[in-house]
């Protein structure tokens, strides 16, 4: 059973006092919602007990394994069903703790019933305050009987529930009729789903007889133990103030355990601690009486004597429950009380026994839960015991449960039973998560989802080359960190996979899946250097670079032009493709913007050092277009063209540029600079007869502004062909005619 | 779905006895404590008797209290009312009503007895 | 036998409120929060429509509200609709475990 105890402190007056811890004695308990489980949960559960709303109540976490409920306000506060659930996946466990009100017209005799299938539980609610009114019985919140206030028997009111199976478990209730319900006696019936003494899905197996009130777990036998008491059966008593599964834990304060009560998983319930009893635990024991809710009797033989939270307590000489057993009659020494091995191991386990006469090898026997007996192979005689070795023959699943050491003389016999988990190594369900890779190493997250049993207390991954016989590389790391496969070569598949072992000899599980994993390029070392560059408009750098010379093949793919734009904080990233390149022309860039240039080679996904960065400015944006250009043929050589200067201009214009081309022709066209900015008209000379032409013009202030719209017009007939076009400006107002 | 069935009402003389029954449908009957009610012609509702879940504990009105017996059989999910000496002022339609905490639902449809002669 | 006393007849418009009152002692009414109210149709059983003095079962109209003060324990009809018009009974728990009812109201709808 899971390791979990829910502690109500019952000192109740004053509620704002009142509180209610959870503790874990689990390994990792409420570690958060990380790979080991998640938080433990401890909640009023309003479902069937609803109690008027108060201010929230403060939950407080100590350390990873305790949780405490405070902030109750006022009695009413208290009244109801608390849950605290820890453990984590299929062990997730809830424990229940009822609460009821001291000052209720009625009080449970006794709040946890837990009783076996097929029996008959009794529920009594004592008068308290009584009134002259039916009394109704609720189960979960919901009517279920009605009793004639007439029907109560010595000052109590019973509800006989003849033949109860699982699903009569639940909390139940007994209220007078119109009565506040936190008036009401509130009480849990728990319904083992076995009838007495079996356990297991068909109830065919047989529990181990739980000692000191400890409850049989009716799903994997185990014993419930009281608190106070540990043990495969609950044969142990712990030291006065402690409990849980280990005696682990501590009662807080300085009166020990006086107060609390213990709630634990069902079927226990909830009781006192060992050595208390009352509705508040706050009595002693009366003579003769000890452990959980004072429910055991001593009955101590041969001068032993009573203790309220162990039992008796035997004089030298004799031992046993009641100390009936002299020490002549042999006895079991110091067995474990749980043991663990791997599947299909072959373990050899030790038992040790004394006595009068002394036990010798052959009066020792192991027999296991399918009633095989095992002898020994091997005994070690000391002067005060023997002990002896059995050779397990190689384990199997069914082989868990509860083995029996035996020992007999002529003195009389002793047996002890011990629990066997055979726990199945891990094997991991998925295979190595790549987290990161370098040209000559790979980075693996190796935790993985697995089947088997936990915990995971090494992990192997298996490395090699894909497609290679060689031996597999193997690393061993611990569980909860990344891996980091070193030493590979580059751009190299290997396959990986995991293998998980868990404590004990033969808990290294099966391999895992594998998983290709490849290892990057090599990265380029060489630094390339920036030449030069040039600004072949307002929005367009021609860069050029140089690598320097070494031997052998150039490692790299192509380059990467990074241009950094302080001012916006924005980086633009040009890829050039081919390794054999040297320059590049970078477009679409932001006029009038200083930018800081630099290159690197690439290979694969890594880059290689960065050139020295450059600063380059780009000029401003020129200004806009001229307005309203028009073209007049003058001769079979010369055209006008007229036009408006541009508006809203920015600055001075230096120049204009006219660009001009034949209609239809294939070779570039011709760009003529008119270096007089006040001039609105210009004479392009030059040209072939009879020959169509376009023509389109630009401001230039700092930058070159933006195009005209292309006009068209063809040169006067039977001309000769002239040496090409030149021009010659005058200012409009002059005329041609000049 | 919850149901209540009465029967056995008729004609009887002064004097006479009847046994009225109740059938249960549709609830864990032996949980419920149950009631007679009846109602003369044209009259209002009077309410007769009551009887406990466990069949220990049976109060009457005063009017039928040593002439009428309530008992129930939780094994046949059966209420009876056996009414003896009886009289023409308990000509009514008796009613079986199931009693949840202090109230009556549901009620069963009525058998009328007549009292004449 | 036990009595409470009821109005024999209540009237109103349609779509007005009307109150029934039930007036008991300290032993019945008075003693436990325990009155129900029922209605019943002409030829048919009664059907409990208020319990626990102000208590509405599932599928009873919230046109109908109860109420208590003292001795006596009030029905209250709003938005009076034609189909309310039958006989209301109150019903109430007593000191000694009986039960009992009111005399009976018609209610007539104007």
């Known amino acids: 059973a899971v390791d979990l105890t829910l502690l109500a402190n019952l000192r109740l007056t004053d509620p704002q006092r009142f509180f209610l811890t959870c503790v874990s004695g689990e390994a990792g308990a409420g570690r958060g919602s990380d790979a080991w489980g998640p938080p433990l949960l401890l909640e009023k559960d309003d479902r069937i007990v609803r109690t008027p709303p108060g201010p929230p109540l403060r939950l407080a976490r100590n350390g990873s394994h305790q949780v405490t409920l405070r902030g109750f306000s006022k009695p009413s506060d208290l009244v109801g069903v608390f849950s605290c659930v820890g453990g984590a996946g299929a062990r997730r466990t809830r424990v229940i703790y009822v609460h009821n009100s001291p000052g209720a017209h009625l009080l449970p005799d006794k709040v946890t019933h837990t009783v076996n299938k097929g029996d008959t539980a009794v529920l009594s609610a004592r008068v308290h305050k009584e009134k002259q009114t039916d009394v109704i019985w609720k189960s979960n919140g919901s009517y279920f009987y009605t009793l004639d206030w007439h029907e109560a028997q010595d000052g109590r009111f019973l509800l006989q529930l003849p033949n109860v199976q699982p699903p009569s478990s639940g909390i139940y209730s007994a209220t007078y009729l119109e009565a506040s319900p936190l008036g009401s006696a509130f009480f849990r019936l728990i319904v083992r789903g076995c009838g007495a003494g079996r356990w297991g899905p068909g109830c065919t197996k047989e529990c181990p007889g739980c000692l000191h009130g400890g409850v049989c777990h009716d799903h994997d036998g185990e014993c419930v133990c009281p608190p106070g008491f540990t043990g495969t059966r609950c044969e142990q008593a712990c030291r006065e103030g402690r409990f849980g599964q280990s005696c682990q834990e501590q009662c807080p304060g300085i009166s020990g355990c006086r107060g609390l009560t213990f709630c634990l998983p069902d079927p226990y319930g909830c009781s006192c601690g060992s050595g208390w009893r009352g509705s508040q635990c706050q009595e002693a024991c009366a003579p003769g009486h000890f452990g959980a809710d004072c429910r055991l009797q001593c009955q101590c033989q041969n001068g032993g004597t009573c203790d309220r939270f162990s039992g008796c307590v035997c004089p030298s000489g004799w031992h046993g429950v009641h100390c009936e057993k002299s020490d002549r009659i042999p006895q079991i020494l110091n067995m474990a009380s749980e043991l663990e091995f791997n599947l299909e191991t072959m373990p050899r386990i030790n038992c040790a026994a004394a006595g009068n006469p002394f036990p010798v090898r052959g009066s020792i026997e192991l027999r296991k839960p399918d009633g095989t007996v095992l002898l020994s192979t091997k005994a070690i005689v000391e002067p005060e015991k023997t002990t002896a070795e059995f050779e397990v023959p190689r384990l199997v699943l069914a082989d868990s449960g509860f083995w029996e050491c035996r020992v007999s003389t002529s003195g009389g016999q002793d047996s002890r039973r011990f629990k066997v988990n055979v726990k199945v190594p891990p094997v991991p369900l998925a295979a190595p998560r790549l987290l990161t890779k370098q040209s000559r190493q790979l980075v693996v997250s190796p935790l993985v989802s697995f089947s088997g049993d936990g915990p995971i207390s090494t992990v192997r991954l298996h490395y090699r080359p894909q497609d290679s016989t060689m031996d597999w590389s193997t690393i061993v790391v611990d569980p909860s960190e990344n891996v980091t496969l070193m030493n590979l070569r580059p751009k190299t598949g290997y396959s990986v996979r995991v293998q998980l072992s868990r404590p004990g000899e033969g808990g290294e599980g099966a391999w895992g899946p594998p998983t290709l994993m490849t290892t990057d390029c090599p990265e380029p070392l060489l630094q390339p250097w920036l030449e030069g560059w040039h600004v072949e408009g307002t929005d367009r750098l021609r860069v050029s670079w140089s690598l320097p010379l070494v031997p052998g093949p150039l490692v790299g793919d192509g380059f990467l032009l990074r241009l950094w734009d302080g001012t916006r904080g924005q980086e633009r990233r040009e890829n050039v493709s081919s390794p054999q390149a040297r320059t590049a022309l970078l477009t679409g860039l932001t006029p009038g913007t200083h930018y800081q240039l630099d290159v690197q080679l690439y290979h694969c996904t890594l880059l290689g050092p960065a050139s020295p960065p450059a600063h380059v400015l780009l000029p401003p944006s020129g200004p806009p277009a001229p307005r309203h250009l028009h073209a007049q043929a003058l001769s079979d050589s010369e055209i006008q063209l007229t036009w408006k200067h541009p508006e809203a201009l920015p600055g001075p214009i230096s120049k204009y540029v006219v660009e001009v081309q034949v209609a239809g022709g294939a070779g570039d066209p011709l760009w003529i600079d008119v270096d007089r900015p006040e001039e609105t008209s210009t004479i392009i000379r030059g040209l072939n007869a009879s020959t169509r032409y376009l023509f389109r013009m630009r401001a230039s202030i700092q930058g070159l502004g933006d195009w005209s719209n292309t006009v068209e017009e063809s040169t006067l007939g039977n001309g000769l062909q002239a040496e090409g076009p030149v021009q010659e400006s005058r200012a409009a107002e002059e005329g041609l005619d000049q | 779905e919850v149901q209540l069935l009465e029967s056995g009402g008729g004609l009887v003389q002064p004097g006479g006895s009847l046994r009225l029954s109740c059938a249960a449908s549709?609830?864990?009957?032996?949980?419920?404590?149950m009631h007679w009610v009846r109602q003369a012609p044209g009259k209002g509702l009077e309410w007769v008797s009551v009887?406990?879940?466990?069949?220990?504990?049976?109060y009457y009105a005063d009017s039928v209290k040593g002439r009428f017996t309530i008992s129930r059989d939780n094994s046949k999910n059966t209420l009876y009312l056996q009414m003896n000496s009886l009289r023409a002022e308990d000509t009514a339609v008796y009613y079986c009503?199931?009693?949840?905490?202090?109230?009556?639902?549901?009620w069963g449809q009525g058998t009328l007895v007549t009292v004449s002669s | 036998q036990y009595e409470l006393t009821q109005p024999a007849s209540v009237s109103g418009s349609p779509g007005q409120s009307i109150t029934i009152s039930c007036t008991g002692t300290n032993t019945d009414v008075g003693g436990y929060n325990l009155v129900s109210w029922y209605q019943q149709h002409p030829g048919k059983a009664p059907k409990l429509i208020i319990y626990e003095v102000s208590n509405r079962p599932s599928g009873v109209s919230n046109r109908f509200s109860g109420s208590k003060s003292g001795n006596t324990a009030s029905l209250t009809i709003s938005g009076l609709q034609a189909e309310d018009e039958v006989d209301y009974y109150c019903g109430s728990y007593t000191s000694s475990s009986t039960h009992v009812f009111g005399s009976g109201t018609k209610v007539t709808v104007l």
């Open positions: 549709g609830f864990t009957f032996s949980a419920y404590k």
């Open positions: 009503a199931r009693g949840t905490a202090g109230w009556f639902d549901p």
């Open positions: 009887i406990y879940p466990s069949g220990g504990w049976t």
